[in-house]
C-alpha cells in the first residue's frame, strides 16, 4: 500500500522564497516519520529533511545547505525554502516515508512541483531613460 | 529596549546534563525565531540550534545533535536549551541570539552569554 | 558547508586609522553576509547585515561591501572604542557559519 502525493504542478518563488505545500492520503498525527524534498528529475538532490516524531517538535535539516523549515498538518507538511538562487529552478518532488507503526510506508512518486526562481530584476529609472533611437 | 539574559550555565561532569534559560524582553518574543550560538574560551563563534516562532519546528548543528533540544515558552517570553550527555568540547559562553522571521539566521540581538563548563 | 576565511587575522592600527578587513566565502553567498563587533567579555554587536546595510545605532564610520564571494567591512576612522574583534557570518546556506575572526588592537 502506498501514500498517494499531492503537490502544486508550478509554484513561483518571489523574493528567493517559496512555500510547497506536499498533501498525503494519509494522517501523520501521532505518528514517526520522515517528510522530505528532493530536487531534479532523478530526485537526486535532498533539499530538506522534515522528521516527525508523534506529536513532538519537528526536527529540520537539509545536507545540501538549503535554508529551509517545515510545518505540520494532520495529512501535510509545508516546506518553506529562503534563498533560493534563480538557476535553482528545478522540478521538486515531495517524499514521505511513515516509519511507526508497522508497517513501513512511502509514497507513490508524485508529479512534483516546477519551481520557477524569479530574479530581481532592476526596473531603468524614468530619470534616466536610455539612448534614444533617432 | 530588547534584553535577552542567559542563565543555568556551570560546572558539569562529562556525561551529565545541563538545562540553559534564556529570558526575553523589550519585544514581541513568539514573533521571533531564536538560536544558540556558543563560543568555546579563546575561540570563534559556532551556531548551535534554532526553534521558529511558534516552537513547532527546530534544527541543531551535527555536533550536537541527538544530545541537545531546544524549546521556547512564548507565555514567559523564554528560551530554553536541554543539554545531555555533555562533552569537554561543549565547554563554551552560550549566548542566545534573536532573528526574525523573515531572515532566520540574522542575529540583530544576543544576550550576554551563560559560562558552560564539562569538566571532572 | 560554507567557510568563511577572514583577514588579517589582526590588524594593528592606531586611532584616527582606516581599518579594511577582509571575508572570503568558499562559495557564493550573494549578499546574505553580516558583521558583528565583539569586545572581551562582552557579547556580539550586529554591525552589517546584508553584506552592506548598517543595523540601528551603528556610526556610519562602519561600512560594508561585497557580495558573491568577497566581503569587506571597512571602519573609516578608527576611534578608542572600535579595537575589538570582528566576526562575519553567512545566512545563504544552512548551516550558518561564523569566519574565524580578525582581532583589530591598537599598533
Known amino acids: 500500500n502506498k501514500i498517494l502525493v499531492k503537490q502544486s504542478p508550478m509554484l513561483v518563488a518571489y523574493d528567493n522564497a517559496v512555500n510547497l505545500s506536499c498533501k498525503y492520503s494519509y494522517n501523520l498525527f501521532s505518528r514517526e516519520f520522515r517528510a522530505s524534498l528532493h530536487k531534479g528529475l532523478d530526485s537526486a538532490v535532498e533539499v530538506c529533511v522534515v522528521y516527525g516524531n508523534y506529536s513532538q517538535q519537528l526536527q529540520v535539516y537539509s545536507k545540501t545547505g538549503f535554508n529551509c523549515d517545515g510545518k505540520l498538518g494532520n495529512e501535510s507538511v509545508t516546506f518553506y525554502l529562503q534563498n533560493l538562487y534563480v538557476n535553482q529552478t528545478d522540478i521538486y518532488f515531495c517524499k514521505i516515508e511513515v516509519m511507526y507503526p508497522p508497517p513501513y510506508l512511502d509514497n507513490e512518486k508524485s508529479n512534483g512541483t516546477i519551481i520557477h526562481v524569479k530574479g530581481k530584476h532592476l526596473c531603468p529609472s524614468p530619470l534616466f531613460p536610455g539612448p534614444s533611437k533617432p | 529596549e530588547v534584553q535577552l539574559v542567559e542563565s543555568g550555565g556551570g560546572l558539569v561532569q562529562p556525561g551529565g546534563s545541563l538545562r540553559l534559560s534564556c529570558a526575553a524582553s523589550g519585544f514581541t518574543f513568539s514573533s521571533y525565531w531564536m538560536h544558540w550560538v556558543r563560543q568555546a574560551p579563546g575561540k570563534g563563534l559556532v551556531w548551535v540550534s534554532r526553534?521558529?516562532?511558534?516552537?513547532?519546528?527546530?534544527s541543531f548543528a551535527d555536533s550536537v545533535k541527538g544530545r541537545f533540544t531546544i524549546s521556547r515558552d512564548n507565555a514567559k517570553n523564554t528560551l530554553y536549551l536541554q543539554m545531555n550527555s555533555l562533552r569537554a568540547e561543549d565547554t563554551a559562553v552560550y549566548y542566545c541570539?534573536?532573528?526574525?522571521?523573515?531572515?532566520?539566521?540574522?542575529?540583530?540581538?544576543w544576550g550576554q552569554g551563560t559560562l558552560v563548563t564539562v569538566s571532572s | 558547508e560554507i567557510v568563511l576565511t577572514q583577514s588579517p587575522a589582526t590588524l594593528s592600527l592606531s586611532p584616527g586609522e582606516r581599518a579594511t578587513l577582509s571575508c572570503r566565502a568558499s562559495q557564493s553567498v550573494s549578499s546574505y553576509l553580516a558583521w558583528y563587533q565583539q569586545k572581551p567579555g562582552q557579547a556580539p554587536r550586529l554591525l552589517i547585515y546584508d553584506a552592506s546595510n548598517r543595523a540601528t545605532a551603528i556610526p556610519a564610520r562602519f561600512s560594508g561591501s561585497g557580495s558573491g564571494t568577497d566581503f569587506t567591512l571597512t571602519i573609516s576612522s578608527l576611534e578608542p572604542e572600535d579595537f575589538a574583534v570582528y566576526y562575519c557570518?553567512?545566512?545563504?546556506?544552512?548551516?550558518?557559519?561564523f569566519g574565524q575572526g580578525t582581532k583589530v588592537e591598537i599598533k
Open positions: 526553534v521558529n516562532s511558534d516552537g513547532s519546528s527546530a
Open positions: 557570518q553567512q545566512r545563504r546556506n544552512w548551516p550558518p557559519t
Open positions: 541570539a534573536r532573528a526574525d522571521n523573515s531572515s532566520w539566521y540574522h542575529f540583530d540581538y
